[in-house]
C-alpha cells in the first residue's frame, strides 16, 4: 500500500453568501490526522499518533496552510454563479501518494453539494468531468476562476502536487508513520439470541495496515457470507482500526466454532468461551 | 462404528438425472457437516459439494454449479446429491464424506462409493 | 480456485525407507490442509489434519509439516501397507480442493 496524505476541505454558501468558517480534515495513511475547526482555524492532530508524528512543537504552519487553503476554496465558491437558496456547500479533496517503487500520484476533486463536478491529475494537469450537464456547467465555472487565480496568487493552487508531497515526506520522516505491523487483539464473546442459539461475536482492535482477513469457521471450514454479519473496518482513534464479524450458532456447539483472523501474514484461531458466563441481552445482572 | 452406505449410482445418458443418496449411521447425523467427492476412472479425488449442519452453508465445485444440488433429511441420517444436466465428464465414483468435529475442514469418514456412469 | 500440485507424481521406494511428498498450494492456505491415503478399489483415509496433526490411530511414523503455501508428507519408515496413493486437500477457500496425488509403489 502506499503511503497517502488526503486534504478534505468544507466551505459553506448560505443564500449566495459565503461563510467563513470551514472545516479541514487531513488523513495520514488513512488515518484521522489533523483537523481545522470551523471558525477559528487551529491545526488539531488526532490522538496522540497525530502528536507523535508532529513531535513536539506549534501547529503554526499546518494552521497557516490550512487557514490559506480555507481562504482560497471561499474564493472560489464565491465565483460558482446561480447559486439557488438555502445551503450549498463545495467540497475540495486532495490526495498524494508516494508508492513502494518512489512513484508518485497526486489528484485533486471538487464537490458541490457533495456531488463530483471537477477532478485533476496534478501531476498531468489533466481535467476531467462528469457527463452531467450540471455537473459540466460548474467545472466551466471553477475551471475559469482557477486558471485567472493561478495567475494572481501562489497560495492554494500553486505547485499543489509538489507542496502535498513535501508535507507527506516531512511526516514520513517522524518515523512513526514508516511502513509498520500492529498485530490486533481478538475478543470473542457470546450473548443470548433466542431460545437455543446464542450470537457469538469475534472484535478485532488496534491493528494496522486496515487489510484484515475475519471470518466464522465451523470444523475449519468458513461459513457462508449470509450467515455472517461483519462490521466496516474503522480508524479507533489511535492510528490503528478496529472491526467485528458475528455469527448465530446452536448452544451446544461452541466448540465447533471459531473466530479466524489472518493480517499481514500472521494467523490466528479463536474459540467462543465456554458458557458458564454469559452476556445477557437485558438491563438485569 | 460410523458407516456411510451411498445408493442411487448408476447408468445414465447425457443430459439425464440422477440422484444419490448417503444413509448414516454411528454417529449423531445431524450435527455433521457432509460432502460429496467424486473420483473418475483411474483419476484423483475431485471435491462436489459440501452441506453443513442445519443445511445453513452450502458450497459446490464450479465445475457442478447449477446443475447439482446437495441436501440432507437428519431426520433420516441421509445426505443427497440430485444431478441434473449430466455429462460424460461426470462419470465417476461418488463419495459421501463427513466432515471432522473441530478439523480443518477434514474428511474423517467416507462411504465405499456408488458409480455413475454417464454414456450414451 | 486454489490450485495444489503434488511433487512427485509417483515414487518407487522399499520397506523401511523415509519417503517425502510436497504439496504447493497456488495461494496462501495457512495451515488448513489435509493428508489422505487410498488404497484400489478402497475409500480415503485421513492421516494428518491442519498441516501437522496427527489423526487418531494413525501411525506415528507418519507426520505432516509446513504452513502458508509449502506442505510436507513424510513416512518416516515405509511399511508394506503404505503402498498407496497420498493426496493433500485444502479447506483454506470454500472451493475445497485435492491435489493430483503421489503414488508410492514397491522399488
Known amino acids: 500500500e502506499p503511503h497517502s496524505l488526503r486534504y478534505n476541505l468544507t466551505v459553506l454558501s448560505w443564500d449566495g453568501s459565503v461563510q467563513s468558517g470551514f472545516l479541514t480534515e487531513v488523513h495520514l495513511d488513512g488515518q484521522p490526522f489533523l483537523r481545522c475547526d470551523r471558525q477559528k482555524c487551529r491545526a488539531k492532530p488526532q490522538g496522540q499518533w497525530a502528536e507523535d508524528v508532529l513531535g513536539n512543537k506549534t501547529w503554526d504552519r499546518e494552521t497557516r496552510d490550512l487557514t490559506g487553503n480555507g481562504k482560497d476554496l471561499r474564493m472560489t465558491l464565491a465565483h460558482i454563479k446561480d447559486q439557488k437558496e438555502g445551503l450549498h456547500s463545495l467540497q475540495e479533496i486532495r490526495v498524494c501518494e508516494i508508492h513502494e517503487d518512489n512513484s508518485t500520484r497526486s489528484s485533486q476533486h471538487f464537490y458541490y453539494d457533495g456531488e463530483l463536478f471537477l477532478s485533476q491529475n496534478l501531476e498531468t494537469k489533466e481535467w476531467t468531468m462528469p457527463q452531467s450537464s450540471r455537473a459540466q456547467t460548474l467545472a466551466m465555472n471553477v475551471r475559469n476562476f482557477l486558471k485567472e487565480d493561478a495567475m494572481k496568487t501562489k497560495t492554494h493552487y500553486h505547485a499543489m502536487h509538489a507542496d502535498c508531497l513535501q508535507e507527506l515526506r516531512r511526516y514520513l520522516k517522524s518515523g512513526v508513520v514508516l511502513r509498520r505491523t500492529v498485530p490486533p487483539m481478538v475478543n470473542v464473546t457470546r450473548s443470548e439470541a433466542s431460545e437455543g442459539n446464542i450470537t457469538v461475536t469475534c472484535r478485532a482492535s488496534g491493528f494496522y495496515p486496515w487489510n484484515i482477513t475475519l471470518s466464522w469457521r465451523q470444523d475449519g471450514v468458513s461459513l457462508s457470507h449470509d450467515t455472517q454479519q461483519w462490521g466496516d473496518v474503522l480508524p479507533d482513534g489511535n492510528g490503528t482500526y478496529q472491526t467485528w464479524v458475528a455469527t448465530r450458532i446452536c448452544q451446544g456447539e461452541e466448540q465447533r466454532f471459531t473466530c479466524y483472523m489472518e493480517h499481514s501474514g500472521n494467523h490466528s484461531t479463536h474459540p467462543v468461551p465456554s458458557g458458564k458466563v454469559l452476556v445477557l441481552q437485558s438491563h438485569w445482572q | 462404528e460410523v458407516q456411510l452406505v451411498e445408493s442411487g449410482g448408476g447408468l445414465v445418458q447425457p443430459g439425464g438425472s440422477l440422484r444419490l443418496s448417503c444413509a448414516a449411521s454411528?454417529?449423531?447425523?445431524?450435527?455433521?457437516?457432509m460432502n460429496w467427492v467424486r473420483q473418475a476412472p483411474g483419476k484423483g479425488l475431485e471435491w462436489v459439494s459440501y452441506?453443513?449442519?442445519?443445511?445453513?452453508?452450502?458450497y459446490y465445485a464450479d465445475s457442478v454449479k447449477g446443475r447439482f444440488t446437495i441436501s440432507r433429511d437428519d431426520a433420516r441420517k441421509s445426505l443427497y446429491l440430485q444431478m441434473n444436466s449430466l455429462r460424460d465428464e461426470d462419470t465417476a465414483v461418488y463419495y459421501c464424506?463427513?466432515?471432522?468435529?473441530?478439523?480443518?475442514?477434514?474428511?474423517?469418514?467416507w462411504g465405499q462409493g456408488t458409480l455413475v456412469t454417464v454414456s450414451s | 480456485d486454489i490450485q495444489m500440485t503434488q511433487s512427485p507424481s509417483s515414487l518407487s521406494a522399499s520397506v523401511g525407507d523415509r519417503v517425502t511428498i510436497t504439496c504447493r498450494a497456488s495461494?496462501?492456505?495457512?495451515?488448513?490442509l489435509n493428508w489422505y491415503q487410498q488404497k484400489p478399489g478402497k475409500d480415503p483415509k485421513v492421516l494428518i489434519f491442519?498441516?501437522?496433526s496427527l489423526q487418531s490411530g494413525v501411525p506415528s511414523r507418519f507426520s505432516g509439516s509446513g504452513s502458508g503455501t509449502d506442505f510436507t508428507l513424510t513416512i518416516s519408515s515405509l511399511q508394506p501397507e503404505d503402498f498407496a496413493t497420498y493426496y493433500c486437500q485444502q479447506s483454506y477457500s470454500t472451493r475445497f480442493t485435492f491435489g493430483p496425488g503421489t503414488k508410492v509403489d514397491i522399488k
Open positions: 464424506a463427513r466432515v471432522m468435529v473441530r478439523g480443518s475442514g477434514t474428511f474423517d469418514y
Open positions: 495461494q496462501s492456505i495457512t495451515y488448513f
Open positions: 491442519a498441516a501437522s
Open positions: 452441506i453443513s449442519t442445519r443445511s445453513s452453508t452450502i
Open positions: 454411528g454417529f449423531t447425523f445431524s450435527t455433521y457437516s
